[in-house]
């Protein structure tokens, strides 16, 4: 091409304006509405309607003229309701009385199949603290808990730890103000993500793995019940619930004398084929480095807020970015992968299976995951959960994007980062971060209260537009947030990952650990090596910043080498000392298991509060392995081995 034909260089302000103008003309609500038409609803994972929507998305990606569109098939096990209904009954202690409370319309996937009978005890939300605070012992009893605050899986795991024999979950009117008390709802009880019968490895059809079972599966039955059913149970219970629970006045604590509750669950396992649909806009400089933008497609109920909003955002962003590239001269350096996952309702199964399939290589190529799920649940607040590597990017974006209703900047609190909540198991971003070591972000426009219809048959477009009349504006703002992330991550020469943020995370951990220095001394241990590792990490980040400053931005080779060092930061916080199969969420900050820094602190606390439960040998291991993981991250960031000070 002649010099005259050169595509003019587009700068951040040009791209930001371009994105904004394109989004101004996008009709998000009609796409959301389309995705909630009868031909696509309900779309339980693996169902015909889920597949119909997969085909539609694949078609749309092709019509967007993305560089490449493809699909991944996985064969996974889910749990569905049997034709024999699950039941909750009240019985007399002599079992002659059998009063049906409910044959629930919903269910909890991956529940243990069993029939259990016993006293029923209310355990509030079912958090660890809730169980600790109970006056009535729950061992040998069923527990009833409110939905909210933590995932179903965590509620069940906590109940199991307290030796409960079964769990009932309901939505109280105070937290979930749904008029119809008979509304049923759905969830899953796998304390993990992915197919629980192929833990830590992918479930492609041709992989001949031996039968296996995730340790995160519950060993007790669990069932969701309607509020009407809960109220009927409360009629047979006594003791008012504590006022600080802030729940319905009907709430009661424990079954009356001569009364028992019987829970019968008989769900069935079903192997299904799920489809993940992908489309890519290839980068112009480093096409083998990509940001992944994903959304859950399936849903047990209509799933308007749960999956249609995210899927609509995914489709519209694919169209917008394709137009920016093909028509408006945007040349992203790195690639953008658009992903539509299935079986999200069963614990981010589609997303996790993809990650498991490419475990050894994905962190070398994918440098960020942007989750679009449940991005619009209200209007009042903008909330975000993410890896600290993305905090700087998030802050810049919050300063740039205006609130869809107030018109003010989303950046209203300079202390926002300290209020960021950890990604939880029920978020598709969690496995990216905690399993694969890929920086991930999930955000939402939401209220102080939970969106009441998630996981229910009432999660319809009609209810969504009624709850959020300015749905189009809010969806547009969500698209702008994600779009700005995508531009900044693929356009800038220097990778927009703030590796220095982990210095303050490490410092915070050491501050917490330092409170127990007397205990550590008494065990004849020292924190010197941990401080040394932390110091090495700090020096490595400083050196990398200096290297960036001193490098020639036009030298692609040098910039790629520096960016590759940045890309490895998150990955190197995955503990190399635990098996991805036994402990898939290896991240020492954000994962789960005894290798995490929070587990180390919780364990050390026991030395004072419950000495019999404290295991010094285990603690010594935890401390040593945490130290080495941090040291390893420092070494990886430093670059080549001849640059690493090996005095350690």
């Amino acid at each position: 091409k002649d010099d005259d034909d050169k595509v003019p260089q587009l700068y951040w302000d040009d791209l930001k304006k371009m994105l904004s103008e394109k989004l101004d003309t996008t009709d998000f609500t009609s796409t959301i509405k389309l995705l909630n038409e009868n031909s696509y609803v309900p779309r339980e994972a693996g169902s015909q309607k889920d597949e119909n929507l997969a085909w539609y998305i694949e078609n749309q990606f092709r019509e967007c003229k993305l560089s490449k569109v493809w699909r991944d098939e996985h064969f996974v096990k889910i749990q569905v309701k049997d034709s024999a209904q699950n039941s909750v009954t009240i019985t007399g202690t002599n079992s002659e009385f059998v009063y049906l409370v409910e044959n629930p319309g919903g269910y909890v996937a991956y529940s243990q199949n069993a029939t259990v009978t016993g006293k029923l005890v209310h355990a509030n939300f079912g958090t660890e603290k809730d169980f600790e605070d109970l006056d009535s012992p729950v061992n040998g009893s069923l527990v009833i808990v409110r939905a909210g605050k933590i995932t179903f899986a965590e509620k069940v795991a906590n109940a199991e730890s307290a030796n409960a024999i079964g769990v009932l979950i309901y939505m109280d009117k105070t937290k979930f103000p749904i008029v119809d008390a008979d509304v049923s709802f759905f969830g899953h009880a796998h304390l993990g993500t992915g197919d629980p019968y192929t833990p830590g490895f992918p479930s492609f059809n041709h992989t001949q793995f031996p039968p296996s079972r995730s340790s995160g599966l519950p060993n007790i039955p669990v069932q969701t019940i309607s509020r009407a059913a809960a109220e009927r149970l409360f009629e047979n219970m006594e003791g008012d619930c504590p006022s600080d629970w802030k729940t319905d006045s009907s709430c009661r604590m424990v079954t009356s004398q001569n009364k028992s509750v019987k829970l019968s669950v008989s769900n069935v396992m079903k192997e299904i084929k799920i489809l993940n649909i992908f489309g890519v806009i290839k980068g112009f400089v480093e096409p083998d480095r990509y940001v992944v933008v994903g959304a859950q497609r399936d849903s047990w109920g209509p799933g308007a807020a749960k999956s249609s909003v995210g899927t609509a955002l995914l489709l519209e962003l694919a169209q917008t970015f394709s137009d920016m590239v093909l028509k408006d001269g945007f040349q992203p350096s790195r690639s953008i992968v658009f992903a539509s996952w299935s079986a999200g309702d069963f614990g981010s199964v589609g997303a996790t299976e993809w990650l498991e399939g490419y475990l050894s290589s994905l962190h070398l190529k994918a440098f960020t995951f942007i989750n679009l799920d449940k991005a619009v649940l209200g209007t009042s607040n903008f909330r975000v959960s993410a890896s600290p590597l993305l905090y700087a990017l998030i802050e810049k974006t919050m300063q740039e994007v205006k609130h869809p209703v107030t018109g003010l900047s989303l950046y209203q609190d300079s202390n926002w980062a300290s209020k960021v909540e950890k990604l939880t198991f029920d978020n598709a971003a969690f496995p990216f971060l905690a399993y694969s070591g890929i920086p991930a972000v999930s955000f939402c426009f939401c209220e102080d209260t939970d969106y009441p219809y998630l996981g229910t048959t009432m999660d319809t477009y009609k209810e969504l537009i009624e709850k959020i009349p300015q749905l189009n504006k809010v969806a547009r703002a969500a698209a702008e947030v994600a779009g700005q992330f995508m531009i900044k991550l693929t356009h800038d020469v220097e990778l927009n990952l703030d590796y220095e943020r982990y210095n303050s995370q490490l410092l915070s951990f050491l501050r917490n650990l330092n409170q127990y220095r007397a205990d550590i001394r008494e065990m004849g241990l020292s924190l010197q090596w941990l401080y040394s590792a932390r110091g090495d990490f700090f020096r490595a980040t400083s050196r990398l910043t200096t290297d960036f400053k001193n490098s020639e931005k036009t030298d692609r080779f040098v910039m790629k080498e520096l960016n590759d060092r940045v890309m490895k930061v998150e990955y190197y916080f995955l503990s190399p000392y635990v098996s991805p199969r036994e402990s898939p969420f290896r991240h020492i900050f954000w994962g789960s298991g005894s290798h995490t820094l929070s587990a180390l602190l919780e364990h050390l606390k026991l030395r004072k509060t419950n000495n019999r439960a404290f295991n010094e040998t285990l603690f010594r291991n935890q401390l040593a392995l945490a130290t080495w993981t941090i040291q390893g991250a420092a070494n990886a960031l430093s670059g080549d081995i001849w640059d690493i000070d090996n005095e350690f």
């Epitope: 059998v98 009063y99 049906l100 409910e102 009629e235 009356s256 001569n258």
Partner: antibody
Framework: QVQLVESGGGVVQPGRSLRLSCAAS????????MHWVRQAPGKGLEWVAV????????YSADSVKGRFTISRDNSKNTLYLQMNSLRAEDTAVYYC???????????WGQGTLVTVSS | QSALTQPPSASGSPGQSVTISCSGT?????????VSWYQQHPGKAPKLMIS???KRPSGVPDRFSGSKSGNTASLTVSGLQAEDEADYYC????????????FGGGTKLTVL
Amino acid sequence: QVQLVESGGGVVQPGRSLRLSCAASGFTFSSDAMHWVRQAPGKGLEWVAVIWYDGSNKYSADSVKGRFTISRDNSKNTLYLQMNSLRAEDTAVYYCARDRQWLAFDYWGQGTLVTVSS
Amino acid sequence: QSALTQPPSASGSPGQSVTISCSGTSSDVGGYNFVSWYQQHPGKAPKLMISEVSKRPSGVPDRFSGSKSGNTASLTVSGLQAEDEADYYCSSYRDSNNFDVLFGGGTKLTVL
């Protein structure tokens, strides 16, 4: 609204049989326990039989045991009482009643009169 | 003869309170809280007034209350009104070899 309508009563000779029906509407019949209660003319109430929501358990009073059988058809929302070997002392108004829980009969039919007489 | 013992009659003037007793044993009234009270007007089906000793179903005036002490249950009607004149029956579960529901012989309440 909840409605229970008994039918099948009448005059019958001792030793003969009769089948009472109770048609239910206005509630989820298949979810509730159902009872038959009788009342002899000018006398008090006497419990006759119970059947649990799914028909799994049935119990009857000693005075009718072996002669009367309670049953239900949840698909038809109907409760039945098969009365065999009828005696003069079985003469009464027979009521069907819904038991939401703990023997609290919150809805009753209008009753059907059974007269056992030769 | 009924297994639960009720007085055959009780009376009171409008506005007054009346209590009807229902005596049983430790195998029925005393052993379980499954005591109900029914009101029956002549020629009509019975109506549930109290369940589980003291629970009042919706629609029943709060003038009606139930209680239990030992093997005896009681129904109290306060602020008597003319329409309260009726027969009142107590019932209870009895723990025996056979599942059993007992009724009292009934109390005729007269409003003077």
